[in-house]
Interface confidence: medium
């Protein structure tokens, strides 16, 4: 049993829409191979530390194997882009499953960037963060279209956005839909119209492909174009892609290298 897009991230009651300064936003520029090599050990230790993650991964892995087995018959797996591995598919399925995983993961992502130490010692989703980030990069590079209009409904809160012109980030991995009507149905509290350039379609890797899901990474920046807060119905916020901004880069690999010799701990 799994979730429906565009309502994945449940923020607290009334949240400011800003640059999400505490969000962990690593893009892993220049350390993809090192991170991939570190995954087996890291994943094992995170499974031990995080039951929700271990259970969610196991469920997603079963689903992935099933889809692989039946993919040729039912066409349930899309052609993967170069570099796309099984673990990317499992990570996307784990994120989209209707389990507590996506909720706990995104809550942790929003806080993990409070400090480098917080990420290194208290963030037990390093593997999932890396795999989702890399999967979106691979899927985006494989797509012919550049930017796209998507829609996102949020259940459970109204955002307190800065005025038009402000630069904001969404704070975590954000699920949206290519289908306006799908997002509108779920957007009982806040409805977003988003022009994204870094979001990637994950339709073929979601538990619910019919929702035409697009996943937006936490480091994409947007300009607030317009907002409205009607007394009845959802608040409406319209965002346009600006670019990307990260405070952190390759933090896990830097720390690993520090253990075996001199290192530079600055963030890029």
């Amino acid at each position: 049993q799994s979730y429906s897009i565009s309502q994945l991230d449940i923020f607290s009651q009334e949240t400011p829409l800003d640059m999400a300064p505490a969000s962990f936003d690593d893009q892993y520029a220049g350390c993809l191979a090192d991170m991939t090599a570190a995954l087996p050990d890291l994943n094992h230790s995170e499974f031990q530390a995080n039951k929700v993650y271990a259970d969610g991964w196991a469920q997603a892995n079963n689903q992935w194997q099933e889809r692989r087995a039946w993919g040729s018959v039912w066409g349930s797996l899309p052609p993967s882009p170069p570099g796309f591995r099984d673990e990317h598919g499992v990570a996307l399925l784990a994120y989209t499953a209707n389990s507590p995983l996506h909720k706990e993961f995104n809550a942790a992502v929003r806080e993990a960037g409070r400090s480098r130490a917080h990420y290194l010692h208290h963030f037990s989703f390093k593997t999932l963060h890396f795999l989702l980030t890399e999967a979106l990069q691979l899927l985006r590079s494989h797509r012919s279209r550049g930017c796209q209009q998507v829609y996102r409904g949020v259940h459970g809160l109204r955002f307190r956005p800065a005025g038009p012109g402000a630069t904001v980030r969404l704070g975590g991995f954000a699920s949206a839909s290519l289908k306006n009507v799908a997002a509108q149905q779920f957007g009982e509290d806040t409805f977003f119209g988003i022009w994204t350039c870094l979001g990637a379609p994950i339709r073929g890797y979601s538990f619910f492909p019919e929702e035409e899901e697009v996943l937006i990474p936490p480091f994409e920046t947007f300009q607030v174009i317009n907002t409205s807060r009607p007394t009845q119905g959802p608040a409406r916020i319209y965002l346009r892609a600006l670019g990307k901004r990260s405070t952190y880069n390759c933090e896990y690999i830097k720390e690993k290298k520090c253990r075996s010799g001199p290192c530079w701990l600055g963030s890029s």
Partner: antibody
């Protein structure tokens, strides 16, 4: 606007089967991250969860009442139906349907119907 | 099944009082949700995911806790707050409710 409305008999006789219908609007029963539960409340007592159903037809029932309950849905009619066999006077209660936001093991009930009082008496 | 035990079952308080209701679970749960029910009406979602206020709920309500002990706090009671409050978990099937706490005017 999300609404749920229960309908069914107000009076049933002991040993009879109760059939309750929940008609929903403002959301679709095909929404994969929402479901519908039936919950009851005997007069002056606490809430008791009975059953739920999700868009993929996944169902779950109260352990103690499992053998007597059946839940089903008709997405095109936006209806969820609960049947409860072998009714007894202790089953007298207000029966609510409620929308589940979330999923198995992490959901909650974010919208409730007004409830329908069912009395079991001969 | 996870049992939820609320304390107290009955509580008399005055307008302006600070009130705390506790919900204890027989096993550890990840989240607790709270509902308010007034006589003759259906329950209304008050707090979800332990500490998040439902839409339209006044900020005098707050929730906290972890593991097996959770609390609902009303910082300054208002006349409209006199009702019955229920906690609910769904960390494991089946979802269960507490027995309720009836909050009455002193």
């Amino acid at each position: 606007q999300v609404t749920l409305k229960e309908s069914g008999p107000v009076l049933v006789k002991p040993t009879e089967t109760l059939t309750l219908t929940c008609t929903v609007s403002g959301f679709s029963l095909s929404n994969a991250r929402m479901g519908v539960s039936w919950i009851r409340q005997p007069p002056g007592k606490a809430l008791e969860w009975l059953a739920h159903i999700f868009s993929n037809d996944e169902k779950s029932y109260s352990t103690s009442l499992k053998s007597r309950l059946t839940i089903s849905k008709d997405t095109s009619k936006s209806q969820v139906v609960l049947t409860m066999t072998n009714m007894d006077p202790v089953d007298t209660a207000t029966y609510y349907c409620a929308r589940i936001y979330g999923g198995d093991s992490w959901g909650y009930f974010d919208n409730w119907g007004q409830g329908t009082l069912v009395t079991v008496s001969s | 099944d996870i049992q939820l035990t609320q304390s107290p079952s009955f509580l008399s308080a005055s307008v302006g009082d600070r009130v705390t209701i506790t919900c204890r679970a027989s096993s550890s749960v990840s989240y607790m949700h709270w509902y308010q029910q007034k006589p003759g009406t259906s329950p209304k979602r008050l707090i979800y995911d332990t500490s998040k206020l439902a839409s339209g709920v006044p900020s005098r309500f707050s929730g906290s806790g972890s593991g097996t002990e959770y609390t609902l706090t009303i910082s300054s009671l208002q006349p409209e707050d006199f009702a019955t409050y229920y906690c609910q978990q769904w960390s494991s099937n089946p979802p269960t409710f507490g027995q309720g706490t009836k909050l009455e005017i002193k």
